[in-house]
């Protein structure tokens, strides 16, 4: 259950691949499409809020045994709107809502070498985020191999100005 | 409750290697990473290196690479971290730490070892 | 690597005061700082993490706040179980890296 329906602090970054491609997000017939892509030297790099929120996980619901207080993490990269996990498709979209936010908007935020991150499905322990053919997707990884597989490795740039949607 | 207890202090020549144990109870040894911090005499904190109780990733402060090696033992939940080719610079009070979070390290660390007093003298 | 500069090094106080004490980052980030209490002889304590948030079991008068490249911890009314020395510490990036140490003293 997360702690708490407030988050403990919000940041406002730009998302990044292992191999430093930019995460990018275009409204295309009024839904949001989702792109990873090299971007133009003098192209602005889009900005996603991330909320952090502190969630106690009880290893009963966490495949890998993990159990203890974990960071869980929305991203939003425009006003109403929130990365969601889809499961069934093993797709990442981004979804108009209201809060509060459903359980498939959060997820697990691990910290890995070299300053990346990764995000776990909070609905689907196991299943994070990825980059599959220039697109995201949800990656199931095997716990008993090395989380470090770069297609679910992300770089945060964090920009600092007032933690604000910015539109 | 949760608790890290250490090893007891250690004398070592310069050049000789000392391995230092932190056992954990109270919790889930494999869901929190520790991290190892040391304290000179009458000095400040040094952070010197991060290890995944889960899977055993580390990450050791450049300063300390090649020379510094964090292990752990989730059989007995026990996090071990060796230090070789001592010099007196590398005497100091040695904590093991806890990070408040399973899978991050953006919260400090909650619990903390009470310490092992490593003297490096001829 | 992000430094951290904390200030002042040492200050004398007495029971009741309220004390401030800074952090100063090389470089600016968000919100993960963590804050510490030592007393001599003993492992330090968390007092404050994600820059403003309290730890569990930590009395109120203790508060952090900030973001970007300052930090600051403050003691509402300084109790004789407060004087000891306080670090800061940034958890936002490897290597972490702690403040010099603030001694806070009895004047």
């Known amino acids: 259950s997360i702690t708490g329906i407030s988050p403990i602090t919000e940041s406002l970054a730009s998302l990044s691949t292992y191999n430093d491609q930019s995460i990018t997000f275009a409204l295309e017939d009024e839904s949001y499409e989702i792109y990873v892509e090299d971007l133009k030297k003098d192209k602005k790099k889009d900005k996603v809020l991330l909320s952090y929120y502190e969630s106690q996980h009880p290893s009963s619901e966490s495949g890998d045994g993990v159990d203890g207080k974990m960071l869980m993490v929305t991203l939003s990269p425009t006003k109403d709107f929130w990365l969601q996990a889809n499961n069934k498709e093993h797709s990442v979209e981004l979804h108009k809502c209201e809060k509060p936010l459903p359980d498939q908007a959060f997820f697990v935020l691990h910290n890995r070498s070299f300053n990346c991150v990764s995000f776990e499905c909070k609905t689907d322990p196991g299943v994070f985020i990825g980059v599959k053919d220039n697109h995201l997707a949800l990656i199931k990884v095997d716990y008993s191999e090395n989380l470090g597989s770069e297609n679910i490795l992300f770089k945060l740039s964090e920009i600092l100005e007032h933690h604000h949607h910015h539109h | 409750q949760v608790q890290l207890v250490q090893s007891g202090a250690e004398v070592k020549k310069p050049g000789a290697s000392v391995k230092v144990s932190c056992k954990a109870s109270?919790?889930?040894?494999?869901?929190?990473?520790i991290s190892w911090v040391r304290q000179a005499p009458g000095q400040g904190l040094e952070w010197m290196g991060w290890?995944?109780?889960?899977?055993?990733?580390?990450h050791y402060v450049q300063k300390f690479q090649g020379r510094v090696s964090m292990t752990t033992d989730t059989s007995t939940s026990t996090a071990y971290m060796e230090l070789r080719s001592l010099r007196s610079d590398d005497t100091a009070v040695y904590y093991c730490a806890r990070h408040s979070y399973t899978t991050s390290w953006y919260g400090g660390f909650d619990y903390w070892g009470q310490g092992t007093l490593v003297t490096v003298s001829s | 690597d992000i430094q951290m500069t904390q200030s002042p090094s040492s200050v004398s106080a007495s029971v009741g005061d309220r004390v401030t004490i800074t952090c100063r980052a090389s470089?600016?980030?968000?919100?993960?700082l963590a804050w510490y209490q030592q007393k001599p002889g003993k492992a330090p304590q968390l007092l404050i993490y994600a820059a403003s948030s309290l730890q569990s079991g930590v009395p109120s008068r203790f508060s952090g706040s900030g973001s970007g490249s300052d930090f600051t911890l403050t003691i509402s009314s300084l109790q004789p179980e407060d004087f000891a020395t306080y670090y800061c510490?940034?958890?936002?990036?490897?290597?972490?890296?702690f403040g010099g140490g603030t001694k806070v003293e009895i004047k």
């Open positions: 470089q600016g980030f968000s919100s993960w």
């Open positions: 109270g919790y889930t040894f494999n869901s929190y990473g």
């Open positions: 510490q940034q958890a936002n990036s490897f290597p972490l890296t």
């Open positions: 290890i995944s109780s889960h899977n055993g990733n580390s």
